[in-house]
C-alpha cells in the first residue's frame, strides 16, 4: 500500500481530517505479527480496528481507539471532556484491581475509588476486568470526573522494573532479547520526520532472525539489526534504501548542538 493518501480520498466529503495521515489507508506492512491496532477510516469517518503486521505501514495507526479518535476526529477532545464532566462514571471504574489469569507484566492504569485517582498497575495480559486502561489519559477521561477533580492528579509512581518473585526483570531484556539502545537522540525540534524514526531498534518478541534496518537518529544513518519476526516498533525496514527514504528526510541540519546526551 502507498504511504500517501489516494487522490480519491480528498473527494470523500466535507469532513476534513485533522492530519493528512488520517486520510491514509490502513497499511498492515510486510511483517507477519498480528497486532490489534486502530486507524481512521475516511469513508466512515470513524476509527476502526485492523491487524498490523509489526513493521513499516504508515502513520494512520494507533495503539488505542482513544488515541485514534483524539488524533483524527475534529472536536473529539471537547465532546469527550463534556461527556465526562456531565455524566456519571461507568460502573467498571469501581471494579477492584484485577491482574488477570496470566502473568505477562504489562503496564496499565486503573481508577482507584479510594484515592479517586487513576493509578498504574501491573496487568498479567489476559482476562482481567474493564477497569484497565492502556494510557493514563484514557483512564482519566473515562473515570476521573473533571468537575470533581479540578486539580491535576499525580500519577502513582511504579518502577519500570517489575519484580518477578525474587528476580528483577528489566523490560528491555524480556525474553532474553537485548534491545539495542541508541545513546544519543536528537531533540524533537531538530527532527521533523516520522516519530518512529526516533525510536531505538527493537528486536521484537519472537524467535526468528531476519535482517532489518533501523534509522539511528544520532548518526543520521540506517543500520542493520536482527528482527525476531513479530512485535517491535515501526523503526524497522526491509531495506536500507526504504529506511533512508522514510527517515532521512526529517532531519533538520543543526550546526551546533544537534544531539542531547
Amino acid at each position: 500500500l502507498s504511504e500517501e493518501a489516494d487522490d480519491t480520498d480528498s473527494e470523500l466529503g466535507s469532513m476534513k481530517p485533522l492530519h493528512t495521515f488520517c486520510a491514509m489507508k490502513a497499511d498492515d506492512g510486510p511483517c507477519k505479527a498480528m497486532i490489534r491496532s486502530y486507524f481512521f477510516n475516511m469513508y466512515t469517518h470513524q476509527c476502526e480496528e485492523f491487524i498490523y503486521g509489526g513493521c513499516e505501514g504508515n502513520e494512520n495507526r494507533f495503539d488505542t481507539l482513544e488515541e485514534c479518535k483524539k488524533t483524527c476526529i475534529p472536536g473529539y477532545e471537547k465532546t469527550a471532556v463534556k461527556a465526562a464532566s456531565g455524566a456519571e462514571r461507568p460502573d467498571f471504574c469501581f471494579l477492584e484491581e484485577d491482574p488477570g489469569l496470566c502473568r505477562g507484566y504489562m503496564k496499565r492504569y486503573l481508577y482507584n475509588n479510594q484515592t479517586k485517582q487513576c493509578e498504574r498497575f501491573v496487568y498479567g495480559g489476559c482476562l482481567g476486568n474493564r477497569n484497565n486502561f492502556e494510557t493514563l489519559d484514557e483512564c482519566k477521561k473515562i473515570c476521573e470526573n473533571p468537575v470533581h477533580s479540578p486539580s491535576p492528579v499525580n500519577e502513582v509512581q511504579m518502577s519500570d522494573y517489575v519484580t518477578d518473585g525474587n528476580t528483577v526483570t528489566d523490560r528491555s531484556t524480556v525474553n532474553n532479547i537485548v534491545v539495542p539502545q541508541s545513546p544519543k537522540v536528537p531533540r524533537r525540534r531538530d527532527y521533523r520526520g516520522r516519530p518512529w524514526c526516533l525510536q531505538p531498534a527493537d528486536s521484537g518478541l519472537c524467535k526468528a532472525s531476519e535482517r532489518r534496518f533501523y534509522y539511528n537518529s544520532a548518526t543520521g544513518k540506517c543500520h542493520r539489526f536482527n528482527y525476531t519476526g513479530c512485535g517491535g516498533n515501526n523503526n524497522n525496514f526491509t531495506t536500507r534504501r526504504r529506511c533512508l527514504r522514510s527517515c532521512k528526510t526529517g532531519l533538520i541540519k543543526n550546526k551546533s548542538k544537534g544531539v542531547v546526551k
Partner: antibody, heavy 123, light 112 residues
Framework: QVQLQQSGPGLVKPSQTLSLTCAIS??????????WSWIRQSPGRGLEWLGI?????????RYAVSVKSRITINPDTSKNQFSLQLNSVTPEDTAVYYC?????????????WGQGTLVTVSS | DIVMTQSPLSLPVTPGEPASISCRSS???????????LNWYLQKPGQSPQLLIY???NRASGVPDRFSGSGSGTDFTLKISRVEAEDVGVYYC?????????FGQGTKVEIK
C-alpha cells in the same frame, strides 16, 4: 509433574448441592503462576467452563453467568486443594466434571486436568 | 459470549496423510502484543482433555512437531502434517480473550 485428583459423589438428588474436591500435588493452590478451574462436559453442551480462582496479591474468582447464582469455588490452603459447590441442581447439571490448572506463566492454558467425575442428577 | 465454531465436526483420516481443523471465533482474539488468545486441546477416547497448542501457535511440552496451529483475528487452523493412529479423538479450540472462557463444539478425528 502436577497431578489433580478429584473426589466427590457421583449421584446427587435434584434441588440438592453438588460438592466436588480437587486435590493438588506438584503445585500449590496459592501459587501466583497458576489458576484453578472447574469445567464440565455433557453431550448436549460440550465443554462448559464454570469458574476459576487464583491468588495474586489476594484471592480472585470468576464464574460463568449461567451458574453464577449457584456456584462457589473455594481454595483450601491447608489441604492444598480446591472445591466446587453447585447449589439447587437439576437434571440439566448431569455431566462429567473436571478440575483443571490454568498455567499463568508462558503457557497460557489448561495444561493439567483431573480424571473427571461423572455426576448424575436424579431422584 | 464469544462463540467458537469448529469445522468439520467429523474428520475421517488416513494414517500418514495430513489433516486440518478450522476454528472460527465470533470476535477477534488478537491482542496488542501480537498474542493470540486461542488454545487447542485433544481429548483421546476415555481420557481428560490435554493441551496441544497455546497462544495460537505454540506447542505444549511433549506435543509432537507434526501438530501446528496458525491463524489470526477470527480464523484459526490446527494442522496435523501426518496423522498417526494415536491422534484419534476429539479436538477442541478454546478462547481466553474474555469471560466466559468458551470452547468449540469439537471435531472428532477417526481413522478411515
Amino acid at each position: 509433574q502436577v497431578q489433580l485428583q478429584q473426589s466427590g459423589p457421583g449421584l446427587v438428588k435434584p434441588s440438592q448441592t453438588l460438592s466436588l474436591t480437587c486435590a493438588i500435588s506438584g503445585d500449590s493452590v496459592s501459587s501466583d503462576s497458576a489458576a484453578w478451574s472447574w469445567i464440565r462436559q455433557s453431550p448436549g453442551r460440550g465443554l462448559e467452563w464454570l469458574g476459576i480462582i487464583y491468588k495474586r496479591s489476594k484471592w480472585y474468582n470468576r464464574y460463568a453467568v449461567s451458574v453464577k447464582s449457584r456456584i462457589t469455588i473455594n481454595p483450601d490452603t491447608s489441604k492444598n486443594q480446591f472445591s466446587l459447590q453447585l447449589n439447587s441442581v437439576t437434571p440439566e447439571d448431569t455431566a462429567v466434571y473436571y478440575c483443571a490448572r490454568w498455567h499463568s506463566d508462558k503457557m497460557w492454558g489448561f495444561d493439567d486436568w483431573g480424571q473427571g467425575t461423572l455426576v448424575t442428577v436424579s431422584s | 459470549d464469544i462463540v467458537m465454531t469448529q469445522s468439520p465436526l467429523s474428520l475421517p483420516v488416513t494414517p500418514g496423510e495430513p489433516a486440518s481443523i478450522s476454528c472460527r471465533s465470533s470476535q477477534s482474539l488478537v491482542m496488542s502484543r501480537g498474542i493470540t488468545y486461542l488454545n487447542w486441546y485433544l481429548q483421546k477416547p476415555g481420557q481428560s482433555p490435554q493441551l496441544l497448542i497455546y497462544k495460537g501457535s505454540n506447542r505444549a511440552s511433549g506435543v509432537p512437531d507434526r501438530f501446528s496451529g496458525s491463524g489470526s483475528g477470527t480464523d484459526f487452523t490446527l494442522k496435523i502434517s501426518r496423522v498417526e493412529a494415536e491422534d484419534v479423538g476429539v479436538y477442541y479450540c478454546q478462547q481466553y480473550d474474555s469471560y466466559p472462557l468458551t470452547f468449540g463444539q469439537g471435531t472428532k478425528v477417526e481413522i478411515k
